[in-house]
Interface confidence: low
Amino acid sequence: AGLKLMGAPVKLTVSQGQPVKLNCSVEGMEEPDIQWVKDGAVVQNLDQLYIPVSEQHWIGFLSLKSVERSDAGRYWCQVEDGGETEISQPVWLTVEGVPFFTVEPKDLAVPPNAPFQLSCEAVGPPEPVTIVWWRGTTKIGGPAPSPSVLNVTGVTQSTMFSCEAHNLKGLASSRTATVHLQALPAAPFNITVTKLSSSNASVAWMPGADGRALLQSCTVQVTQAPGGWEVLAVVVPVPPFTCLLRDLVPATNYSLRVRCANALGPSPYADWVPFQTKGLAPASAPQNLHAIRTDSGLILEWEEVIPEAPLEGPLGPYKLSWVQDNGTQDELTVEGTRANLTGWDPQKDLIVRVCVSNAVGCGPWSQPLVVSSHDRAGQQGPPHSRTSW
């Protein structure tokens, strides 16, 4: 089969909105199924027409009623012939129209009176394309070739900019870009002390409005009373909007406040948030833990622990922990310095320890007391010592 595009030059230039008819001549086939292809894809949704010139000579037409820029491309026709695909020479269709924007001015946020640039680019065909800039409803300067960059020395209020592209076919207007003024950020909010220990505090907060400029850091200020002497000031990069305060004094009342900064400067401080560090756990272990075996069980006694530092606060209750060879174990809490142990197996060795607790937690464990299964009583010593008499 012979195949060729007829009635069209290698390059065909058409104005946007105008009709185009491409034709394809096929010889040596009866009623060929002519397929039109554009840029490698079969054209299925456009009008196609077949004209039989003779029994073995057909002309197929591809009719584009009103061409748009998207119709531009490389067209050819193809037919199936004995399992082979015959492909014609291509025709390049160029669609001329008003300029088409490839780059439009983007919204910006800038500091007051700071210089900035806006870009605009449009293409034909036809070329050349010239650009005219608008500031609000005022034209700025004369036409410039595309692409164009507008240099603005600064603005003192939010301002609208757009560009207009011109070629021989007419003009097109870009989107309107709004140039916003950057400002100081708003104060942070929802400030929360998320974790507390005797010397550390974790703080989290939500940033306020960033003033259209990236938040760079936040400052956490700590005092021992609102408005008192600054104990600590920590500057943290953000995000995340969290901070760990270290080296605080146990069992102490503090207040903190937070502010955040962007390139223009810091926000106001948020309101003071009070918090209190936890006290210290007891530093001492109960001494002289001993056991007295009775008919009803085992009585354990130890010496009272006296607070070593005021930060430990009031002490008590005591926590007793015991374990036996058979794996049985238990804990009990008692208010005084004496406990009656029940539920243990006298036939098995017993190891007992005691500690004193406060609001923070338990202090160090006492030396373990070993009560041997054949002892009538026990005494403190290494875990494996046996006492008998």
């Epitope: 840029d39 531009a72 490389r74 193809q78 695909t85 015959e86 291509p90 390049w92």
Partner: antibody
Amino acid sequence: EVQLVQSGADVKKPGASLTISCQASGYTFTDYWISWVRQKPGKGLEWMGRISRHGSQTYYGPSFQGHVTISADRSTATAYLQWRSLEASDTAMYYCVRAGGQTSGGTIPEYYQHWGPGTLVTVSS
Amino acid sequence: SYELTQPPSVSVSPGQTARITCSGDALPKKYAYWYQQKSGQAPVLVIYEDHKRASGIPERFSGSSSGTMATLTISGAQVEDEADYYCYSISPAGNYGVFGGGTKLTVL
């Protein structure tokens, strides 16, 4: 003057992703197709694929279908060749080529007159 | 997949005629193109559409095609013609391109 400027040589580990680029100048980017050609060290040329002038249509050689992605950015007149997961066998020089040339007989798509300098990709663990 | 077959090497003396062949089932319906690649350089188009010389290519280079065979001929080969030569065409369905395996031309 037609110029195809390719990105620099790259060394990657197997399994890594990679995108190499080819920036065209000296002609209207959307008037021509861009093809990519591979050449392994000491071996012959292999046609990898081609992207249409407007970036809407891509063709791939059977050996490369599904392994690489060809794309283009009309605004920067740049074509790209991308791998999601490199293999040691991808070690090669990669050329981008302007596909299509104007001749007395018309525009010939497979007229590969303008070649980039090549990008050497080395994939090694 | 579609293949184009070339001889791995061809040797000629300076001034002699070198012929490099390329065979492929679709060559009766598809054009052949020839590319020259010198060591360490990008390929250069020599012949397009079977027999047309690309711009800037000396007249001693010519191409022909008959049936399933395309041929690149260098009449009066010169030392500077020593290079790898690749034929190129498109698949029978026209949906992908194919290079031949390449022929190393040695001009002794």
